[in-house]
Structure formats: structure tokens, C-alpha cells
């Protein structure tokens, strides 16, 4: 199957102090790579998870990721700051025969806004 | 420290069931998937099944399916092979190993001895 | 099948290096587990393709390319000398393999 990453939400609204889920879904797990979530592009892009182990403070994954049909890559992101407003997107690489991985793929992005905390 | 600890091998007839339990430490082991792999007298390693870290998804080699069963209890950080209809080619020592997050493996138990003879 | 061969020898402080073919570089990773006597615990030297666990000294190394993948020791020890495993995970299939093994022997 021709591989796609989609996120169905161009935007969220969060308010500090809460929490948001980003949705990302693939259609295919080959050709086999790590799955990455980044805000921004370009060469200030900043990771914010990555689906290969390492623990990333605030943010969790939605799904059972261990699955090995998993397609779900969606993440949570607990008690937003103001910080946290951006463009996040969901990325597939493809392994690569030396460091870095390749990557082959983006979701359309999701743009989060950050709400003042209600009085 | 991550350890395993296989228990439940020892010797039964051709025909018989065995569980074998692993006790896993020294990491948060409801995130992580597990398998079992076996090796036969002599011979190499051979992979046999695997579970996600819920639970919910198995996987198997075809030469066990449907007489193996993995599971696990995550709230007593255990690992689980129900092994049925066991012949003399089961006897092997089992070994549960923890997964990568892409199904390699990265820690091994010492492995539990099973012998199937009349 | 995972093709490894079955034996290697090396002089304390060359370079060996271990081949396994079979996979199918598009679907596949590799690790390698090494066994230093038969029916006692493997230790994984190195996983996906290339990692090397924290433990492992940094002589150990890996690489994967088309449909096969090399396990590298730079300055081999004779406390090296042991059975090493190549080892599989097939994303099309959802299945895992292992080579049969290559003796490694430092003479």
C-alpha cells in the first residue's frame, strides 16, 4: 500500500495548563523508519517525540505503539504552555544505510494555539 | 538493571501442557513488547512469539500456532507461554527477551530448560 | 533465511567483520546477539542495524546495506571469542529470524 501520513486537524485549540492530542495516522509501515514528531520546519525544527524509545517529558503516545501493525502515531501533549504554540508535524524517515535516517515523508501539519488559562 | 527471569521448564511427556512464566525488573515493563525464543540442543536461536505491550496483539511463528499461547499481566510485570501438545523437537532451553521499538531484541533472560521425553 | 557463515578466526587485534544476508533492506532490521557457550544467555551486541547498547565496547559495531547487514569487531579480544547470532525483524511479515550462527574463534 502507497504510503501517506495524514493529520486530519489543521489546527487545535488548547488552554494552558491542559492537555491536546494530535492526530496521525499512516497507511503503511514500509519501507520501515522511525516515525518523528517535529514544530516547526527547516533547520530550527525541534523534536518533540520520536516513536523509537527515548522518553520525552509532557509527551506520550496515544496508541500502543509496540503493535507491530500499529498506524496510529497520534501523541499527547500534557499541561501546555504558551511555549508549546506552533506548527507541529508528524514525519516518517526511512532507515538509512548510515546516520541520519531519510526522510520520506510529512503530514500536512497541525497548528496549536495556546489559550490564557480562564480566571 | 533490567532483568528477566524465566521459571517453569522442567521435564514432561510427549502430548503434555507446560507454562512457562518470566519475571521481569528494572524497567517499566507495561511499555515494552516481549517475545519468546527458544533454542534447541545444538542448535540456533529460534523465534516463536511476541506481544505488544497491552497485550492485545500476538504474533506467532507458524510451527507453534494454535498449540502456544504468550500472554502477559502487566500488573504483576510477568510474561506468559502456554505450551500444548508438546513433542521431543519443544525440548529446547526458552528464553523471554524484551523488544526494541522496532521488534529487535535488546535484553535476554538466562532462559529455562524444557525437555519433552518418554 | 538469514545466511551467516558458520565460522571465523582472527588474531587478537585484527578487524573482523561477520556478514548475514537475507533481508530485504526496504522491510528489514537487523541485530546481533552474541552467546559465549551454548544454552547460556545472549547478549545483544548491537540492534537496529546499527545501535550499540550502552554496555557493549565501542570495538563492536554495525551496518546494514541492500539485502545484507555486517557486524564489525576493530580489535578483536580473545574474551570476544563466541557464537554471534544475526537476527531479523521483518516489518512486511511481522515476523522475526535468526541466522544459524557463526563461531567466532581468536586464535
Known amino acids: 500500500k502507497e504510503l501517506k501520513v495524514t493529520q486530519p486537524e489543521k489546527s487545535v485549540s488548547v488552554a494552558a495548563g491542559d492537555s491536546t492530542v494530535l492526530n496521525c495516522t499512516l497507511t503503511s509501515l514500509l519501507p520501515v523508519g522511525p516515525i518523528k514528531w517535529y514544530r516547526g520546519v527547516g533547520q530550527s525544527r525541534l523534536l518533540i517525540y520520536s516513536f523509537t524509545g527515548e522518553h520525552f517529558p509532557r509527551v506520550t503516545n496515544v496508541s500502543d505503539a509496540t503493535k507491530r501493525n500499529n498506524m496510529d502515531f497520534s501523541i499527547r501533549i500534557s499541561n501546555v504552555t504558551p511555549e508549546d504554540a506552533g506548527t507541529y508535524y508528524c514525519v516518517k524517515f526511512q532507515k538509512g544505510p548510515s546516520e541520519p535516517d531519510t526522510e520520506i515523508q510529512s503530514g500536512g501539519g497541525t497548528e496549536v494555539y495556546v489559550l490564557a488559562k480562564p480566571s | 538493571d533490567v532483568q528477566l527471569v524465566e521459571s517453569g521448564g522442567g521435564v514432561v511427556r510427549p502430548g503434555e501442557s507446560l507454562r512457562l512464566s518470566c519475571a521481569a525488573s528494572g524497567f517499566t515493563f507495561s511499555s515494552y513488547a516481549m517475545s519468546w525464543v527458544r533454542q534447541a540442543p545444538g542448535k540456533g536461536l529460534e523465534w516463536l512469539a511476541g506481544?505488544?505491550?497491552?497485550?492485545?496483539?500476538?504474533y506467532y511463528i507458524d510451527s507453534v500456532k494454535g498449540r502456544f499461547t504468550i500472554s502477559r499481566d502487566n500488573s504483576k510485570n510477568s510474561l506468559y507461554l502456554q505450551m500444548n501438545s508438546l513433542t521431543a523437537e519443544d525440548t529446547a532451553v526458552y528464553y523471554c527477551?524484551?523488544?526494541?521499538?522496532?521488534?529487535?531484541?535488546?535484553?535476554w533472560g538466562l532462559g529455562t530448560l524444557v525437555t519433552v521425553s518418554s | 533465511a538469514l545466511t551467516q557463515p558458520a565460522s571465523v578466526s582472527a588474531n587478537p587485534g585484527e578487524t573482523v567483520k561477520i556478514t548475514c544476508s537475507g533481508g530485504?533492506?526496504?522491510?528489514?532490521?537487523y541485530g546481533w546477539y552474541q552467546q559465549k557457550s551454548p544454552g547460556s544467555a545472549p547478549v545483544t551486541v548491537i540492534?537496529?542495524?546499527?545501535k550499540r547498547p550502552s554496555d557493549i565496547p565501542s570495538r563492536f559495531s554495525g551496518s546494514a546495506s541492500g539485502s545484507a547487514a555486517t557486524l564489525t569487531i576493530t580489535g578483536v579480544r580473545v574474551e570476544d571469542e563466541a557464537v554471534y547470532f544475526c537476527?531479523?525483524?521483518?516489518?512486511?511479515?511481522?515476523?522475526?529470524?535468526f541466522g544459524a550462527g557463526t563461531t567466532l574463534t581468536v586464535l
Open positions: 530485504d533492506y526496504y522491510s528489514t532490521y
Open positions: 537476527g531479523a525483524y521483518d516489518g512486511r511479515t511481522y515476523i522475526n529470524t
Open positions: 506481544i505488544s505491550a497491552g497485550g492485545s496483539d500476538t
Open positions: 540492534h537496529s542495524d546499527d
Open positions: 527477551a524484551r523488544e526494541t521499538w522496532n521488534h529487535l531484541f535488546d535484553y
